[in-house]
Amino acid sequence: ELSPQPSNEVNLLDSKTIQGELGWISYPSHGWEEISGVDEHYTPIRTYQVCNVMDHSQNNWLRTNWVPRNSAQKIYVELKFTLRDCNSIPLVLGTCKETFNLYYMESDDHGVKFREHQFTKIDTIAADESFTQMDLGDRILKLNTEIREVGPVNKKGFYLAFQDVGACVALVSVRVYFKKCPFTVKNLAMFPDTVPMDSQSLVEVRGSCVNNSKEEDPPRMYCSTEGEWLVPIGKCTCNAGYEERGFICQACRPGFYKASDGAAKCAKCPPHSSTQEDGSMNCRCENNYFRAEKDPPSMACARPPSAPRNVISNINETSVILDWSWPLDTGGRKDITFNIICKKCGWNVRQCEPCSPNVRFLPRQLGLTNTTVTVTDLLAHTNYTFEIDAVNGVSELSSPPRQYAAVSITTNQAAPSPVMTIKKDRTSRNSISLSWQEPEHPNGIILDYEVKYYQKQEQETSYTILRARGTNVTISSLKPDTTYVFQIRARTAAGYGTNSRKFEFETSPDSFSISGENSHV
């Protein structure tokens, strides 16, 4: 299996990729020899081999072409080679070696003549596994891989050299590379290719946010000498209208939206709304659907409710209780309220005018949350029309006509208003004479008055009622020197008015009469 080269390695030289002859310098010329061979994957390659194992004191050098350093500070040399076991070669015991030496020389130009003494030794290279001839039968080549570090390198380039001292070795491939922290995207921040320092220190790199994102915390990472990114700090987040998809911020697709910057995903447009384009921050409401100003973009678009239904009126003289049913269509919102429009009409329903401000609505006229209202202080024997509007948070945004249910009623005759003042005309030991004014609003012809009285100390546990035709009365059979409480109400054809307030009067202790005394409460 071909193992791909790590992405953090940048090749400066790879003999496998060179087309045709490598053309490296071999010194002396009968030492290292360039031949065609195959690598471990049977791919044809150019290799150098030497197998001068008969002679003592071999000193065969092979020098690469000049290798530019680029931005590298520390370089790595990867050698793949095959070393033949000396025991597998007849006649050569004592002269055959199983190591070779690796050298390098830095240089600013590439026309340098080969001189042994200018090279610095990197290491002696030995095989982890040499092979005997037996391995060749079915082409099992024991391929050794050795990697050595060199650095810091400062000049524009360098040469590598291989010194053979009597081994049977083939250089299958020579790869020289440096490590970089490769371009990467972390937390939606892009970090560029970065060449590490040769020393052990980490390089701090500032990231830049990917397209359509912004910094949440300034993104940073550290590039190690091994070409690895370490310790990500900070992050970017996708803008409104974009969501994180892999390493990018991708526009929300039509039909999806994202209202704010951050890590959230694009959401499907809420009901009755849509988007036609990529990257939407909110969704547009369909025709005749609306969203209130303070509604979040996640809220479904709605329309005004339909009219209330089944309005029932319950008239009691000059009051009416109105009840109705919830609209069939709420428009898709829960914030439905009801407004009552009151119109006072003539006998011709078309001739109406707004009701007097004196008319009272319980609990209120506008913004009702329940489906009932009591309207009081209407005029008796008068035609009224009540329009019950159903509204929700988007009603004011819509142009269609109001959604209301109307009911028309006629008030009955109203009972008279209360008697305001009771006056004591005369008292005796066992009688009191009282008089009073007709109510301010008799609301019809007063038929009679109901006079209710009881001893104060008995606290209304037992009381007496009598009727008076006019606006005065004498009450007899009372106890002397006793306080009595009196209440009077008028009656018309419409019924009794409400009682007056309570008035207190005392009978005399003896037989004389006292006249013209007002009451006290």
Partner: antibody, heavy 121, light 106 residues
């Protein structure tokens, strides 16, 4: 250029001896072993053995021990094959061939032109 | 001693055709054989060694393959100069040759 130069044909009587030279040029003589190969008339190749040109240490193939001797004179880059007590069945072309050891395998990469030795009474 | 048997003894081919020569070892050998070409009146010439490495100057129409006991030399398109005798040779502590295959013009 690399070459191995052998002497011309030899005619010998049975029981006599012959010494066939093989002079190397164009490379360091002591850096490569030398092999000897026999080819009887109309027959195939027979490997006789080889000699380490560095140490002078010979190795003989089966059937080529006793009467056959490999030797060297490194001062003149020459290898020798000496056959004593010649027999009629020794009549053949004798080749010297330079041995090539490589990482991937061995072979004889440079051959002399051959010396015909005829044994006849 | 390992015996190498080559077949066929003679192979008749026309120029431009493919030629396949076989070399069988009497027992499994430790390494692929070397192959040699010999023309009449000339010394043998090394073609291939180390399983599949062509010797210097050998054209790429010559290739070798095989393992264990069965080995093959293939000439992909025979040229007029390729008519000759071909030998396989096993190497190790002791070397042996096959008896040869003659490639002749059909």
């Amino acid at each position: 250029q690399v070459q191995l130069l052998q002497s011309g044909a030899e005619v010998k009587k049975p029981g006599a001896s012959v010494k066939v030279p093989c002079k190397a040029s164009g490379y360091t003589f002591t850096s490569r072993a030398m092999s000897w190969v026999r080819q009887a008339p109309g027959q195939g190749l027979e490997w006789m053995g080889w000699i380490n040109t560095n140490t002078g240490n010979p190795t003989y193939a089966q059937g080529f021990t006793g009467r056959f001797v490999f030797s060297l004179d490194t001062s003149v880059s020459t290898a020798y094959l000496q056959i004593s007590s010649l027999k009629a069945e020794d009549t053949a072309v004798y080749y010297c061939a330079r041995v090539r050891f490589t990482v991937y395998g061995d072979g004889m990469d440079v051959w002399g032109q051959g010396t015909l030795v005829t044994v006849s009474s | 001693e390992i015996v190498l048997t080559q077949s066929p003894a003679t192979l008749s081919v026309s120029p431009g055709e493919r030629a396949t020569l076989s070399c069988r070892a009497s027992q499994s050998v430790s390494s692929n054989p070397a192959w040699y070409q010999q023309k009449p009146g000339q010394a043998p010439r090394l073609l291939i060694y180390g399983a599949s490495t062509r010797a210097t100057g050998i054209p790429d129409r010559f290739s070798a393959s095989g393992s264990g006991t069965d080995f093959t030399l293939t000439i992909s398109r025979v040229e007029p100069e390729d008519f000759a005798v071909y030998y396989c040779q096993q190497y190790g502590p002791s070397w042996t040759f096959g008896q040869g295959t003659k490639v002749e013009i059909k």
